[in-house]
Amino acid sequence: KESCDVQLYIKRQSEHSILAGDPFELECPVKYCANRPHVTWCKLNGTTCVKLEDRQTSWKEEKNISFFILHFEPVLPNDNGSYRCSANFQSNLIESHSTTLYVTDVKSASERPSKDEMASR
């Protein structure tokens, strides 16, 4: 049975192939039972995850799940890297798996790799 703990549905080893200059929304699917937890995004720098304090975020509510969204408007080349969301729930910190953004620079978009090529990196 699914517990009533907060769940962060970012899949282990998930990847997104995106283009610099495009808008992009990175979703952290959050499942909770009663009170919505406080959720934050961070970007991995080695073993440290640096909190993204001044980035635009928003919530999207759906029937069975909510999404805490990190907005990239637009995507920049240095947005390449791995991100993680975290939730504070009843004084517990719950961390998601990291999800990796592969940013293709708009200058080399004509040589942009396919999804499968990106996924096999």
Epitope: K11, S14, A87, E95, H97
Partner: antibody, heavy 121, light 112 residues
Framework: EVQLQQSVAELVRPGASVKLSCTAS????????MHWVKQRPEQGLEWIGR????????KYAPKFQGKATITADTSSNTAYLQLSSLTSEDTAIYYC??????????????WGQGTTLTVSS | DVVMTQTPLTLSVTIGQPASISCKSS???????????LNWLLQRPGQSPKRLIY???KLDSGVPDRFTGSGSGTDFTLKISRVEAEDLGVYYC?????????FGGGTKLEIK
């Protein structure tokens, strides 16, 4: 309750292609990975590959690169395995499996009942 | 690819007696996130595989506590404290740490 529905059997001629389906109920496949696993008669299990239905990213075992193509349709909650240039070596049971490794130790794993593929002239 | 070696190939056990299956990997299954993605599956005759244990030692819901998983790094063990008739089938270890995911060759548990 999560269930994975696969067709029971397929009989295909050598050299042809086949597309096997796996439809999930009770869970949105966008929040999971869908894997395909091969089991030849009286033999062990071989991982073919997996798809992230949320963005279509795929990974294949090197042995199945070029032989297998995995796709997903999130609107019908269905994953597909296409096998090309079929030979008798492709005669096997093909299982789909839905796996999720998330936060809070909420990790699950469900398997379909398998499709028996027979390649014969 | 990571090679998963299971022993023994066949295990013949009397009901009520213990059983132990070993699984050795050709490289460490400890992931960079600190977790070890080692599962144990049971395939009963004529059925699809069913996961019993994940992350080395965590039992899936509905799995009796006579099953225990242990180990770390490259050496893992599945133990059944008292074998019951419903336990017969083929047991597989399965690693998900490294790409591509790989399975052990299987251990067939027979009832004496």
């Amino acid at each position: 309750e999560v269930q994975l529905q696969q067709s029971v059997a397929e009989l295909v001629r050598p050299g042809a292609s086949v597309k096997l389906s796996c439809t999930a109920s009770g869970f949105n496949i966008k929040n999971t990975y869908m894997h395909w696993v091969k089991q030849r008669p009286e033999q062990g299990l071989e991982w073919i590959g997996r798809i992230d239905p949320a963005n279509g990213n795929t990974k294949y075992a090197p042995k199945f690169q070029g032989k297998a193509t995995i796709t997903a349709d999130t609107s019908s909650n269905t994953a597909y395995l296409q096998l090309s240039s079929l030979t008798s070596e492709d005669t096997a049971i093909y299982y789909c499996a839905l796996t999720y490794y998330g936060s809070s130790q909420y990790y699950f794993d469900y398997w379909g009942q398998g499709t028996t593929l027979t390649v014969s002239s | 690819d990571v090679v998963m070696t299971q022993t023994p190939l066949t295990l013949s056990v009397t009901i009520g007696q213990p059983a132990s299956i070993s699984c050795k990997s050709s490289q460490s299954l400890l992931d960079s996130d600190g977790k070890t993605y080692l599962n144990w599956l049971l395939q009963r005759p004529g059925q699809s595989p069913k996961r019993l244990i994940y992350l080395v030692s965590k039992l899936d819901s509905g799995v009796p506590d006579r099953f225990t998983g242990s180990g770390s790094g490259t050496d893992f063990t599945l133990k059944i404290s008292r074998v019951e008739a419903e336990d017969l089938g083929v047991y597989y270890c399965w690693q998900g740490t490294h790409f591509p995911q790989t399975f052990g060759g299987g251990t067939k548990l027979e009832i004496k």
